[in-house]
Interface confidence: low
């Protein structure tokens, strides 16, 4: 309902660290909703009775929102189509000294190019 | 660089209310949401609620729901924290924290205001 | 609410030693999408806290491989493998899957 997380670099612990893409500071994403489920049903809210999703997402209960594909979020208003990693735009390739990188949904995918003079 | 700046120290008198501002840079403002923690000298840090700067929400610790509240001003990238019907158990250093609310909670702090509640 | 208990209080350690605190929290603290939100923050003498340990067991940007933390449910702990004078100050568990979110008490780990 919303709440799913999506694997997505961490300040300072990526999969595919390169400090040349990846300056210190995290890209700016946030990608983890933050409506925490109380263990007892839900906490009253001053929130219960706004509009809480966006982009076609259902509201439930009250305050939480089942998200349709691709997005998420507290409401809805994340959409992993559309995420970055860093200064690198989504669904875009990035060619990097010994490897060739992707940026897909906020991940930086690369793939080693053992072929290339001095990549060995 | 990330940088919180909070608002200077106050003193305040019971009944009144006080107002901490958190000036953020060095970031992308409406990305992360903005913690506030509170610390009674000599004690522990309280959680007294988040907001999400990008749509406003807030999340609220109920023990101070009713005397709290959280605003953004997104124009000049600063966050707010009011607190009324001030006590002298109020008496507090207050840190505003960003956090990207995925990973962890709060990664960067301010330095901290110290609200000093007196008669 | 969840009620983060730490121990011990107060922690002496000799240099070079290494040091233990556990927290404990009065209900399970795993998110409703599978994750546990169980962090680490010291708070040096006259600063702010800093982050060290996210997701129970993730160290943060910066952070010394000295510092690990583990557990899992309501039962977790950080281990320092060799206490260095820096690392004085108070240690603080905090759970970030429900609100309110909230802290232990925190350890004072002191220089023996």
């Known amino acids: 309902l919303g709440h799913q997380e999506f694997a997505r670099p961490s300040r300072g612990y990526l999969a595919f660290r390169d400090d040349s893409i990846w300056p210190q500071e995290e890209p700016a994403i946030r990608p983890r909703s933050s409506q925490r489920v109380p263990p007892m049903g839900i906490q009253h809210s001053k929130e219960l009775n706004r509009t809480c999703c966006l982009n076609g997402g259902t509201c439930m209960l009250g305050s939480f929102c089942a998200c349709p594909p691709s997005f998420y979020g507290r409401n809805c208003e994340h959409d992993v189509r559309k995420e970055n990693c860093g200064s690198v735009p989504h669904d875009t390739w990035l060619p990097k000294k010994c490897s060739l990188c992707k940026c897909w949904h906020g991940q930086l995918r690369c793939f080693p190019q053992a072929f290339l003079p001095g990549c060995d | 660089e990330v940088q919180l700046v909070e608002s200077g120290a106050e003193v305040k008198k019971p009944g009144a209310s006080v107002k901490v501002s958190c000036k953020a840079s060095?970031?992308?403002?409406?990305?992360?949401?903005i913690h506030w923690v509170r610390q009674a000298p000599g004690q522990g840090l309280e959680w007294m609620g988040e907001?999400?700067?990008?749509?406003?929400?807030?999340n609220y610790n109920e023990k101070f729901k009713n005397r709290v509240t959280l605003t953004v001003d997104t124009s000049i990238s600063t966050a707010y924290m009011e607190l009324s019907r001030l006590r002298s158990d109020d008496t507090a250093v207050y840190y505003c924290a960003r956090g990207p609310n995925y990973f962890y909670s709060m990664d960067y702090w301010g330095q901290g205001t110290m609200v000093t509640v007196s008669s | 609410d969840f009620v983060m208990t730490q121990s011990p209080l107060s922690l002496p350690v000799t240099p070079g030693e290494p040091a233990s605190i556990s927290c404990r929290s009065s209900?399970?603290?795993?998110?409703?999408?599978?994750?546990?939100?169980l962090e680490w923050y010291l708070q040096k003498p006259g600063q702010s806290p800093q982050l060290l340990i996210y997701k129970v067991s993730n160290r943060f940007s910066g952070v010394p491989d000295r510092f690990s933390g583990s557990g899992s449910g309501t039962d977790f702990t950080l281990k320092i493998s060799r206490v260095e004078a820096e690392d004085v100050g108070v240690y603080y568990c905090?759970?970030?899957?429900?609100?309110?979110?909230?802290f232990g008490a925190g350890t004072k780990l002191e220089i023996k």
């Open positions: 905090f759970q970030g899957s429900h609100v309110p979110l909230t």
């Open positions: 060095g970031y992308t403002f409406t990305s992360y949401w």
């Open positions: 907001n999400d700067p990008s749509n406003g929400r807030t």
């Open positions: 209900q399970s603290i795993v998110h409703s999408n599978g994750n546990t939100y």
